[in-house]
């Protein structure tokens, strides 16, 4: 009886797992084994497939053998007892087009309101993804455990913390890596749940500020109690994309180690032109407090982010109020190539009600004055990144007085 | 597969000094703390310090801290613990143990420990 | 230094019984636990971490629970390779710190 070829064969690829899956075509004949060769674009010889000769089931895994992922190959399978079927050509395929990504690793750390996530391929070197392994960016499901309302959090990188949890509560997670850049999709890791710990008696510091002094920055924060001791480290923030690097180290700043005050001041060649992340950690002594919020800490923003000038043109019943580029030393105007929010704080000069607009814009409308009326204003520049959270100082109070009630123009 | 391959027993006089020595193989070995622990005989367990492959970086046991000294040689993968002025309360099993991934925010518990290396303090 | 209270120091129980070991922290150590296990002559093994998390490989017999101060290390039905010595230890400040340690033994 002539053997039939095998059917239907299907090919999966998860990172350098290189699996194949076929059916028989005919279950009634028995003992009967299969076995594939390979063709290389531009060959014209076949190549036994090493890991896929003689196979008496309906998979094997070719991932040893060494294959050009950017290569199209072909492949063909026979069914083999006595005699052999006719060869089954598989459509060919390019293995990086085919490749799906793994489901990356995840280690979990827990705090009392928040989770640190670490997330790493899963393949670790990776052959098909060597030119991408920067490049991937990762998302993750949450849920409670005990609700199971889900939350995705999108295009987070390979540390990820989330905040504001509930203590002494299990969540739990599962991540999946994507690369954007060549439209791929990953498969999600298994589920890893964590509990978040007891409430930690000492809180972590909060609001953390950066400004420039002299040749200085001084970095201040809020705490809740006295008498601790605080440390201070930073990270460059372009390693959070890549931990594998062994650059990804939180480092203290020497000057900022068990400093006895809500603030320390170090010298600014401390840090290179730059991006980077700082946190502060409190301790009593006996107890530590978990990591404060990271914020992020530009070089060139913190030196140079100076409050705004502006010029107003009085009304009877509003002013206009035009902001212009801040002036250096020299009246030369500070080119700010980031997006600025402007904070216009505005009081009767006889008044202590201070009144606040918010705008993007650089001509800003105070309405609601009333007529020959002492009125003053000061601003200043936020940058829009919530992470930056940098703000400049306030720029000196101008005072003005609104024109009599008949002007409208 | 992870391992810790520790340097053999050794025997001191008081006043000496001793050099152990731990070699890592299968894992990316500036990317983990390395521990050190020592269990004197018949006793519990008792943490020395822990030094960064990747810059030296250490942390130690207050108790040691004069008198221990943690060393890397990055081209072996091998971490050196040198305990000086020994006494004989030194008399003990020295471990190396891998820590948390440096990386990590927290520390982490010891996942990999060397075979131990046997150090007497006789005269 | 963080003191670490292990209880029992020693504890004798047949093969199939449940055994519970527990240790107390001096201070909060928000799940930084450890629990290992040590036969004679032999390193010791890393068993559970985060308090919970049980280590690839270890058999599912073995369990880790608590919170704050107090941890608990269960054996759900002792085999005859579990009679061994057991430490837990915190990670969460250093100086790094050991209980004192609970012997198993065949009654």
């Known amino acids: 009886k002539n053997l039939k070829s095998p059917q239907k064969v299907e090919v999966d690829i998860i990172d350098d797992n290189f699996i194949l899956r076929w059916n028989r075509s005919d279950e009634s004949v028995g003992n009967v084994t299969f076995s594939f060769d390979y063709q290389k674009t531009g060959m014209d010889n076949w190549i036994k497939l090493s890991g896929c000769q003689n196979i008496t089931s309906t998979k094997c895994n070719f991932s040893s053998l060494k294959l050009n992922v950017y290569e199209e190959i072909k492949l063909r399978i026979r069914a083999e007892k006595e005699n052999t079927s006719s060869w089954y050509e598989v459509d060919s395929f390019t293995p990086f087009r085919k490749a799906q990504i793994g489901p990356p690793e995840v280690h979990l750390e827990a705090e009392d309101k928040a989770i640190v996530i670490h997330i790493s391929p899963g393949t670790k070197d990776s052959v098909m993804w060597a030119l991408d392994g920067l490049s991937f960016t990762y998302s993750l499901v949450i849920w409670k455990n005990s609700s199971g309302v889900e939350e995705r959090i999108e295009n987070i990188y390979s540390r990820h913390k989330i905040y504001k949890l509930s203590p002494e509560t299990t969540y739990c997670l599962k991540v999946k890596a994507a690369l954007l850049t060549s439209w791929k999709i990953g498969v999600y890791s298994p589920v890893h749940c964590i509990k978040t710990t007891v409430e930690n008696e000492l809180p972590p510091p909060e609001n953390i500020e950066v400004s420039v002094q002299n040749q200085n920055y001084v970095l201040k924060w809020d705490y809740t109690y006295a008498n601790m001791t605080f440390q201070v480290q930073w990270l460059h923030a372009f390693l959070k994309r890549n931990p594998g690097n062994h650059l990804y180290k939180w480092k203290q700043i020497p000057d900022c180690e068990n400093v006895k005050t809500t603030q320390c001041v170090f010298p600014q060649n401390v840090f290179q032109k730059g991006i980077y992340l700082l946190r502060v950690q409190a301790s009593d002594g006996n107890n530590t407090s978990f990591w404060s919020e990271e914020i992020k800490f530009d070089t060139e923003i913190q030196a140079f982010l100076l409050p705004p000038v502006f010029n107003i043109r009085s009304l009877s019943d509003s002013f206009h109020i035009y902001i212009g580029a801040p002036k250096q030393s020299g009246n030369t105007p500070v080119i700010q190539d980031y997006p600025l929010i402007y904070e216009i704080i505005f009081w009767e000069n006889t008044s202590n009600a201070e009144r606040k607009i918010i705008e993007k814009k650089t001509d800003v409308t105070v309405p609601n004055l009333k007529p020959l009326t002492v009125y003053c204003v000061k601003a200043r520049a936020h940058t829009m990144d919530e992470k930056l959270n940098k703000s400049s100082v306030f720029s000196d109070a101008v005072c003005e007085k609104t024109k009599p009630g008949n002007t409208s123009k | 597969q992870v391992q810790l391959v520790q340097s053999g027993a050794e025997v001191k006089k008081p006043g000496a000094s001793v050099k152990v020595s731990c070699k890592a193989s299968?894992?990316?070995?500036?990317?983990?703390?390395m521990n050190w622990v020592r269990q004197a005989p018949g006793q519990g367990l008792e943490w020395i310090g822990k030094?960064?492959?990747?810059?030296?970086?250490?942390h130690f046991n207050q108790k040691f801290r004069d008198r221990v000294t943690l060393t890397v040689d990055k081209s072996t993968s091998t971490v050196y613990m040198e305990l000086s002025s020994l006494r004989s309360e030194d008399t003990a099993v020295y471990y190396c143990?891998?820590?948390?991934?440096?990386?990590?925010?927290?520390?982490?518990?010891?996942?990999?420990w060397g075979q131990g290396t046997l150090v007497t303090v006789s005269s | 230094d963080i003191q670490m209270t292990q209880s029992p120091s020693s504890l004798s129980a047949s093969v199939g019984d449940r055994v519970t070991i527990t240790c107390k922290s001096s201070?909060?150590?928000?799940?930084?636990l450890a629990w290992y296990q040590q036969k004679p002559g032999n390193a010791p093994k890393l068993l559970i971490s985060?308090?919970?998390t049980l280590e690839s490989g270890v058999p599912s017999r073995f369990s880790g629970s608590g919170s704050g101060k107090d941890y608990t290390l269960t054996i759900s039905s002792l085999q005859p390779e579990d009679f061994a010595t057991y430490y837990c230890?915190?990670?969460?400040?250093?100086?790094?710190?050991f209980g004192q340690g609970t012997k198993l033994e065949i009654k």
């Open positions: 143990a891998r820590g948390g991934r440096i990386s990590f925010d927290y520390d982490a518990a010891l996942d990999y």
């Open positions: 299968g894992y990316t070995f500036t990317s983990y703390w």
């Open positions: 030094i960064d492959p990747s810059d030296s970086e250490t």
């Open positions: 201070e909060v150590i928000y799940n930084r």
């Open positions: 985060g308090a919970t």
């Open positions: 230890q915190q990670y969460w400040n250093k100086p790094f710190t």
